[in-house]
């Protein structure tokens, strides 16, 4: 995976929250749930109230990148999804407010959001070859592809 310094000269400025309170379901129709204070996992749910609701904030790159760059926050909290390394769980990082500017090593908070039909992919800005992924009997993590599942459906208006 790419070192953090790879993108350290690029600056990302917060624009606005573009989605509120949505659920992420993987290709097996498993919803992302919060198993504990720090990690996420995926499970097939009868009650979608158990699923994590996310907010998505958009950032603009100083190098005028065409990709949509986003931050993911658990709704009604100050917890932000943070990338680690390949096959490592993504963490929930607590911050008092959404960062106005992100650069250097803090790009582990950011993801490139790509959509292909109903499929959504979140690539780590800090590790551009790795995606947010679910993996059987494991936490939500960063992975390059199969056997991990890297495509998600966004479910909105689930209140």
């Amino acid at each position: 995976s790419a070192p953090f310094s790879f993108l350290s000269n690029v600056k990302y400025n917060f624009m606005r929250i573009i989605k509120y309170e949505f659920i992420l379901n993987d290709a097996l129709n498993q919803s992302i749930i919060r198993a504990n204070d720090q990690y996420l996992t995926a499970a097939a749910l009868h009650n979608l109230d158990e699923a994590v609701k996310f907010d998505m904030g958009a950032y603009k790159s100083s190098k005028d990148d065409a990709k949509i760059t986003v931050i993911l926050r658990i709704s009604k909290t100050q917890l932000y999804v943070t990338a680690q390394d390949e096959d490592q769980p993504v963490l929930l990082k607590e911050m008092p407010e959404i960062p106005k500017t992100i650069t250097g090593s803090e790009t582990n908070l950011l993801f490139f959001w790509e959509t292909h039909g109903t499929k959504n992919y979140f690539t780590s800005v800090a590790h551009p070859n790795l995606f947010i992924a679910t993996k059987q009997d494991y936490w939500v993590c960063l992975a390059g592809g199969p056997p991990s599942i890297t495509d998600f459906q966004i479910l909105e208006n689930q209140a």
Epitope: E21, I32, I33, R34, A35, N36, D37, Y39, L40, T41, A43, D49, E50, A51, V52, K53, F54, I74, S75, K76, T77, D137, W139
Partner: antibody
Framework: EIQLVQSGSELKKPGASVKVSCKAS????????MNWVRQAPGQDLERMAW????????TYADDFKGRFVFSLDTSVSTAYLQISSLKAEDTAVYFC???????????????WGQGTTVTVSS | DIQMTQSPSSLSASVGDRVTITCRAS??????LNWYQQKPGKTPKLLIY???RLHSGVPSRFSGSGSGTDYTFTISSLQPEDIATYFC?????????FGQGTKLEIK
């Protein structure tokens, strides 16, 4: 059907140890944390600890550090509470309770064991 | 830590009455408020989570409301089987404290 089944009542002498078990069924054990909650006679519910069922790591409330050990055997979906050097004030009902985050932001204990009464008396 | 203050500590009501219990948090808990029922000698049961959502199998006579720091639990028409102690609990931040409980009796 989701169930948490605890071991039976215990009568112990001061200074002894006790181990209480809580067997879970009806759900994926490692997808949800497990809590231990104490209710002393005539008292409120006190959350003693939370255990990460995936890693086995425990987070203790301040009053329950030292003589209390929380452990797991994930192969049989069971959580354990062990209390050493028992004192009369440990006399209480001990509950296990599954922890769940609703919407990822709001924590609740949605299923509870039937409780295990531990009596410490000489 | 967030403190939870529940009132009243006990109350007596007649079958068919509307019963209300309140719970106040020492700071904003963003609707992360749960209500539990504990019948004498029994295990606690989750009735309501996230302020107003009924847990599975809970009768519709139970309801919850509130926001910010102030929350209310209501039984619209008291039944004999509702004799119990009711606890609130905040689910916003550790250590997820319980209220002191309200013991409900039938007149």
């Amino acid at each position: 059907e989701i169930q948490l089944v605890q071991s039976g009542s215990e009568l112990k002498k001061p200074g002894a140890s006790v181990k209480v078990s809580c067997k879970a069924s009806g759900y994926t054990f490692t997808n949800y944390g497990m809590n231990w909650v104490r209710q002393a006679p005539g008292q409120d519910l006190e959350r003693m600890a939370w255990i990460n069922t995936y890693t086995g790591e425990s987070t203790y409330a301040d009053d329950f550090k030292g003589r209390f050990v929380f452990s797991l055997d994930t192969s049989v979906s069971t959580a354990y509470l062990q209390i050493s050097s028992l004192k009369a004030e440990d006399t209480a009902v001990y509950f296990c309770a599954r922890g769940i985050y609703y919407y990822g932001s709001s924590y609740a204990m949605d299923y509870w064991g039937q409780g295990t009464t531990v009596t410490v008396s000489s | 830590d967030i403190q939870m203050t529940q009132s009243p500590s006990s109350l007596s009501a007649s079958v068919g009455d509307r019963v209300t219990i309140t719970c106040r948090a020492s700071q904003d808990i963003s609707n992360c408020l749960n209500w539990y029922q504990q019948k004498p000698g029994k295990t606690p049961k989750l009735l309501i989570y996230y302020t107003s959502r009924l847990h599975s199998g809970v009768p519709s006579r139970f309801s919850g409301s509130g926001s910010g720091t102030d929350y209310t639990f209501t039984i619209s028409s008291l039944q004999p089987e509702d004799i119990a102690t009711y606890f609130c609990q905040q689910g916003k931040t550790l250590p997820y404290a319980f209220g002191q409980g309200t013991k409900l009796e039938i007149k």
